[in-house]
Amino acid sequence: MSANATLKPLCPILEQMSRLQSHSNTSIRYIDHAAVLLHGLASLLGLVENGVILFVVGCRMRQTVVTTWVLHLALSDLLASASLPFFTYFLAVGHSWELGTTFCKLHSSIFFLNMFASGFLLSAISLDRCLQVVRPVWAQNHRTVAAAHKVCLVLWALAVLNTVPYFVFRDTISRLDGRIMCYYNVLLLNPGPDRDATCNSRQVALAVSKFLLAFLVPLAIIASSHAAVSLRLQHRGRRRPGRFVRLVAAVVAAFALCWGPYHVFSLLEARAHANPGLRPLVWRGLPFVTSLAFFNSVANPVLYVLTCPDMLRKLRRSLRTVLESVLVDDSELGGAGSSRRRRTSSTARSASPLALCSRPEEPRGPARLLGWLLGSCAASPQTGPLNRALSSTSS
């Protein structure tokens, strides 16, 4: 196309980004192929893992406040994982967005929605735990699954609200070499007379606000909640941290490690408007740290399983149930009473009031993972939702 590549007004950093060309260097091409492979694998893993977590926590576990938090975190991660295949396609076609402006806006919005939702939900989890320890009587009376769902809905609404500017200012921009960028274009709406000033102020506002709201404030809430809980538990003489504490700690650590670099580069990018010398650094680093932020959604389900033995047990049973229901022979449907009795007993056990992370009867760590992978034929199968519902009414 021999049209002007940039008919709409663009910020200087975008104009210069449009000059950058795809590489013909062979070693860089190999990195590209590896990146496509890695992102493709992450897409698949993220979708499967978060889907399984949603299924296990939502359908195979007794609903508690804790499972509600995990359910919503997994939902946020599933959304992000669902957008990852499109990012993989962007990489596969040579770093060019071929899916149109509307989908560019939607895809980017999902990334930012996940960013805000994760930060807000982790803050809520920490505050919830803090209230349990600092205000136990109040928590006893007000901590219900319904209340947790309501809080989550409010947090999702806030996350959506914070994502709106990223939807509005996302655009497709043609590069000089013919590739298409899906990137910020802060001059899309009311550019004003001073283009440079508008570019600078808006980019800084976006970068600083997302750093504060989606990273610094959540981490501050998490840290202060943890400090308050630690102080209170010290007075009570508690020593070892509970399993749920370890789960939260792992998820928070992953959140900080995966999103921290992204926010650093996002702030550098905002500075690069006024300081062109930062541009090459930003252009080099931003794709990597964005991928790292995406991978947070793939890491979380692994952390739930690794830090939570009961989750692993439920997961194993659920997978066996799915396999059994698929592989079951017609003649076995009206099978012997002994098998029916065995199922009922397992149902009663599954319906017992279990939190997300109860004490396991199984080995921990790598041995547990290995055991799960190899499978334990002796373990009793999990019942379907109908049987569970019926048995729970009698219990």
Partner: antibody, heavy 122, light 107 residues
Framework: QVQLQQSGTGLVRPGTSVRVSCKAS????????IEWIKQRPGQGLEWIGV????????HYNEKFKGKATLTADTSSSTAYMQLSSLTSGDSAVYFC???????????????WGQGTSVTVSS | DIQMTQSPSSLSASLGERVSLTCRAS??????FSWLQQKPDGTIKRLIY???TLDSGVPKRFSGSRSGSDYSLTISSLESEDFADYYC?????????FGGGTKLEIK
């Protein structure tokens, strides 16, 4: 070696158009950008715009939008600049120059053509 | 647009003399800056890019430096072929802009 060979001097009438050519040799034409620059007699240099020969995408200085049209023919490794509705103010020497970029950085105008003098006179 | 203010506009110097030309950018350009030489026959050659990197084939007597928004071109010992017009160029932001030029003449 890298060379940019421009077309010869042109004497044109006001209101008409002129096309200046810039033939590249000694490098892969489609992997570099071609910039166009104007120099009025006894004056400084002014950037007109840039074209990517591989895609045909271009970017113009606001001042030259509607005046200059940049094109490229990859088969002959030649870049063109068409100047329309010529006035005496368009009388100048026009240069083409090569610029490069990588995935992460760019540089400007490492090799220049010898210039094409365009005189607009009735 | 970024303004490039070049000084002096003309300079007379003798062979073997050391001379410096300066260019000031109206905005931060972070070294996206070049020095160009235009010979009396009109041909243009880039001498320096990225504020201080010498182009291949350019004699070592030419050097570029930067101090904040001020950029300098120094010729340590003038030779006869150095008498020409010199222009600075910023390529940080569109539209790329040039300095007004410095005419270097033999004293």
């Amino acid at each position: 070696q890298v060379q940019l060979q421009q077309s010869g001097t042109g004497l044109v009438r006001p209101g008409t158009s002129v096309r200046v050519s810039c033939k590249a040799s000694g490098y892969a034409f489609i992997t570099y950008l071609i910039e166009w620059i104007k120099q009025r007699p006894g004056q400084g240099l002014e950037w007109i715009g840039v074209i990517h020969p591989g895609s045909g995408n271009s970017h113009y200085n606001e001042k030259f939008k509607g005046k200059a049209t940049l094109t490229a023919d990859t088969s002959s490794s030649t870049a063109y600049m068409q100047l329309s509705s010529l006035t005496s103010g368009d009388s100048a020497v026009y240069f083409c120059a090569r610029s490069g970029s990588s995935s992460f950085d760019y540089y400007a105008m490492d090799f220049w053509g010898q210039g094409t003098s365009v005189t607009v006179s009735s | 647009d970024i303004q490039m203010t070049q000084s002096p506009s003309s300079l007379s110097a003798s062979l073997g003399e050391r001379v410096s030309l300066t260019c000031r950018a109206s905005q931060e350009i972070s070294g996206y800056f070049s020095w160009l030489q235009q010979k009396p026959d009109g041909t243009i050659k880039r001498l320096i890019y990225a504020a201080s990197t010498l182009d291949s084939g350019v004699p070592k007597r030419f050097s570029g430096s930067r101090s904040g928004s001020d950029y300098s071109l120094t010729i340590s010992s003038l030779e006869s072929e150095d008498f020409a017009d010199y222009y600075c160029l910023q390529y940080a932001n569109y539209p790329y802009t040039f300095g007004g030029g410095t005419k270097l003449e033999i004293k």
